[in-house]
């Protein structure tokens, strides 16, 4: 069954752009007019969970490519990758716990906590140029984005 | 309160289709999914497929060659074919609706019928 | 075809806790959802999401799911709790039932 998808850009509140830094990881980092096409579209899968006021169950995929973000346990502490999958699968309106974060909207920023580990967000640091990870809101990470629509 | 009301035939002869249709009475009728499930005589609950209002479909891939799901949204009903049908279809059938909000799951059942298959 | 396991009876005395477990390979990768079902009558939602109960549902319903395991949980149980119980889950393009626990209340 087909399921609903938007296609997003995402910055963080710093305004730094999500880039793709080799195959498998995301970089926060601030781009400029040239290189701008170089941030990576997310594609937003509305799916399995339970949506409430303000927290909807969304998949996050990179538009164009069979990676999805996930997370998992490893050497003990919630962390975030980005995994491969099969097109013909995914996305699927029923994705594998792992691959889900309830999108949080918080006045003009959105925050994205993973389903699987509770007060755990997608995170990026105040350094440039540092891989995106998943954080339990704690010092000066970054976990509130801003979402900009892009046109399928 | 969201009710679902069932009907169609109750007795068939080996080799005839199963029809059954399924009501929707109160609540939306596009933000669902809405399943059928079935239960042979003292066993187990076996999940037939599910449909959206749009007529897309998934189905179980033990069925899938004989199940045809459709779905009316001018009338908030859907319904389910089954064709070749022997004795090991006899069961209960329930039509369900599965909730975003329980996580797209069944959060509402039919009252269910009986369909005998018998020569 | 994914399978999920159940088994097929479990008793209890009244006022005790009764374990139900649904096992399935990386089950606990996925949502577990439970429901009860009564001699004679449609099914019921008791736990979906592996955890969280349906209003109306008493709190003395829980779920856990991890590793290969869901487990349904029912704490002082009362005899209108005997039933049926199935576990449910997703398994990639559609549902999968365990076979289902027929839960028996003691006395």
């Known amino acids: 069954v087909p399921i609903r998808q938007l296609h997003y850009r995402l910055r963080d509140e710093q305004q730094k752009s999500l880039v793709l830094s080799d195959p498998y990881e995301l970089k926060a980092l601030h781009l400029n007019g040239q290189n701008i096409n170089q941030q990576v579209i997310f594609s937003m899968s509305f799916v399995q969970g339970e949506p409430s006021n303000d927290k909807i169950p969304v998949a996050l995929g990179l538009k164009g490519k069979n990676l999805y973000l996930s997370c998992v346990m490893k050497d003990g502490t919630p962390t975030l990758q980005l995994e491969s999958v099969d097109p013909k699968q995914y996305p699927k309106k029923k994705m594998e716990k792992r691959f889900v974060f309830n999108k949080i909207e918080v006045k003009s920023k959105v925050e994205f906590e993973s389903a699987e580990f509770p007060n755990w967000y997608i995170s990026t640091s105040q350094a440039e140029h540092k891989p995106v990870f998943l954080g339990n809101n704690s010092g000066q990470d970054i976990i509130d984005f801003t979402m900009e629509s892009v046109s399928s | 309160q969201v009710q679902l009301q069932q009907w169609g035939a109750g007795l068939l002869k080996p080799s005839e289709t199963l029809s059954l249709t399924c009501a929707v009475y109160?609540?939306?009728?596009?933000?669902?999914?809405w399943s059928w499930i079935r239960q042979p005589p003292g066993k187990g609950l076996e999940w037939i497929g599910e449909?959206?209002?749009?007529?897309?479909?998934n189905y179980n891939p033990s069925l899938k060659s004989r199940v045809t799901i459709s779905v009316d949204t001018s009338r908030n009903q859907f319904s389910l074919s089954l064709s070749s049908v022997t004795a090991a279809d006899t069961a209960v059938y329930y039509c369900?609706?599965?909730?975003?909000?329980?996580?797209?799951?069944?959060?509402?059942w039919g009252q269910g019928t009986l369909v005998t298959v018998s020569s | 075809q994914s399978v999920l396991t159940q088994p097929p009876s479990v008793s209890v005395s009244p006022g005790q806790t009764a374990s139900i477990t649904c096992s399935g390979d990386k089950l606990g990768d996925k949502f577990a959802f439970w429901y009860q079902q009564k001699p004679g009558q449609s099914p019921v939602l008791v736990i979906y999401l592996d955890n969280k109960r349906p209003s109306g549902i008493p709190e003395r319903f829980s779920g856990s799911n991890s590793g290969n395991t869901a487990t349904l949980t029912i704490s002082g149980t009362q005899a209108l709790d005997e039933a049926d119980y199935y576990c449910e889950a997703w398994a990639d393009t559609y549902e999968v039932f365990g076979g289902g626990t027929k839960l028996t209340v003691l006395g």
């Open positions: 109160g609540g939306s009728f596009s933000d669902y999914y």
């Open positions: 369900a609706r599965a909730s975003p909000s329980s996580g797209w799951t069944l959060d509402y």
């Open positions: 449909i959206d209002h749009s007529g897309s479909t």
